[in-house]
Interface confidence: low
């Protein structure tokens, strides 16, 4: 029998799969590649023409507890003279990630996967100008 | 969600740490948000540091499709529409969590995996190294 996966590709289920109650899935939260490090260019959030700041959000009932969000510093972009040019726009770049949410119901606890939208930085774009008739 | 009974003294025995293995509901909260960056915005084309998007597909992972950005130029696009090599287009990278099927091919057994993705590009002033 073929078992559908999240996302409609079909797999032949191996015999070695662990038994899982209906409507749920087994999740090992020991992270693969836990010690991987981001190797981004240095201080790009300050050197960008669309600079941004970082804020750390903390939630003990979320795994991982710490999620870092970026916020663009300006509406416009920084020009060669170091001044804000409002003819251009600083806009956020976003990426989805998964987190595990722990929910308490009385003396019981449940776990739910959740998609979270993270703002990772900003980029400078030419604005879309809408002409009104 | 799937509820797990807590021990009899549950009001006083709050566990601050997540267990190593959890049973989670198959329904993912916020699952239907738009995951295709080409459809969600055209920043990749309008940016002064434009990028192309590469579809990375892996059926052993959820989400199975992830979009990777690659900057189109070394420099940035100036007001005249030309590439200015006095500035640099650089990728903005982010660590995200995905689900990896473990054991492989199992429909309902996963492990969290951290992967590094390039989400887009931004235009930066280069770091100039002066050689003595």
């Amino acid at each position: 029998r073929k078992i559908p996966k999240v996302g409609h590709t079909f797999f032949q289920k191996p015999e070695s799969c662990p038994p899982v109650p209906g409507g749920s899935m087994k999740l090992d939260i020991g992270i693969i590649n836990e010690n991987q490090r981001v190797s981004m260019s240095r201080n790009i959030e300050s050197r960008s023409t669309s600079p941004w700041n970082y804020t750390v959000t903390w939630d003990p009932n979320r795994y991982p507890s710490e999620v870092v969000q970026a916020q663009c510093r300006n509406l416009g972009c920084i020009n060669a003279q170091g001044k804000e040019d409002i003819s251009m726009n600083s806009v956020p770049i976003q990426q989805e990630t998964l987190v595990v949410r722990r929910k308490h119901q009385g003396c019981s606890v449940s776990f739910q996967l959740e998609k979270v939208l993270v703002t990772v930085g900003c980029t400078c774009v030419t604005p879309v100008i809408h002409h009104v008739q | 969600g799937i509820t797990i009974p807590r021990n009899p003294g549950c009001p006083n025995s709050e566990d601050k740490n997540f267990p190593r293995t959890v049973m989670v509901n198959l329904n993912i909260h916020n699952r239907n948000t738009n995951t295709n960056p080409k459809r969600s915005s055209d920043y990749y084309n309008r940016s002064t540091s434009p990028w192309n998007l590469h579809r990375n597909e892996d059926p052993e992972r959820y989400p199975s499709v992830i979009w990777e950005a690659k900057c189109r130029h070394l420099g940035c696009i100036n007001a005249d529409g030309n590439v200015d090599y006095h500035m640099n287009s650089v990728p903005i990278q982010q660590e995200i969590l995905v689900l990896r099927r473990e054991p492989p091919h199992c429909p309902n057994s996963f492990r969290l995996e951290k992967i590094l993705v390039s989400v887009g590009c931004t235009c930066v002033t280069p770091i100039v190294h002066h050689v003595a």
């Epitope: - | 998007l53 590469h54 579809r55």
Partner: nanobody
Framework: EVQLVESGGGLVQPGGSLRLSCAAS??????MGWLRQAPGKEREFVAA????????YYADSVKGRFTISKDNSGNTMYLQMNSLRPEDTAVYYC?????????????????WGQGTLVTVSS
């Protein structure tokens, strides 16, 4: 399998113009592109257009001089080449690919035409 047939190549003087055509038949694709190979050099990306025709991509060396387009049926792709230079001399290939990502990577193109020679010389 997609069949591709290019036409429109020839000899032109520097500063002149040419229009290349590529007729496609067979299964659908995500993008069509023009790539070129000059004598003794590697094949390089010139321009690409998405299957919908909404997205176009150009190599920096041709931006502003070349324009890629498709007819309404989507079966024919064009490359309008203006302000031609001697360094544009090459065999121009039409190709298709899946995905719009890394369009400049010639290794990602799956189906290739036989090529049409463009010579820019006075």
């Amino acid at each position: 399998e997609v069949q591709l047939v290019e036409s429109g190549g020839g000899l032109v003087q520097p500063g002149g113009s040419l229009r290349l055509s590529c007729a496609a038949s067979g299964r659908t694709y995500d993008a069509m592109g023009w790539l070129r190979q000059a004598p003794g050099k590697e094949r390089e990306f010139v321009a690409a257009i998405s299957g919908s025709g909404d997205d176009t991509y150009y190599a920096d060396s041709v931006k502003g001089r070349f324009t890629i387009s498709k007819d309404n049926s989507g079966n024919t792709m064009y490359l309008q080449m203006n302000s031609l230079r001697p360094e544009d001399t090459a065999v121009y290939y039409c190709a298709t690919r899946r995905g719009l990502y890394y369009v400049w990577d010639s290794n990602d193109y799956e189906n290739w035409g036989q090529g049409t020679l463009v010579t820019v010389s006075s």
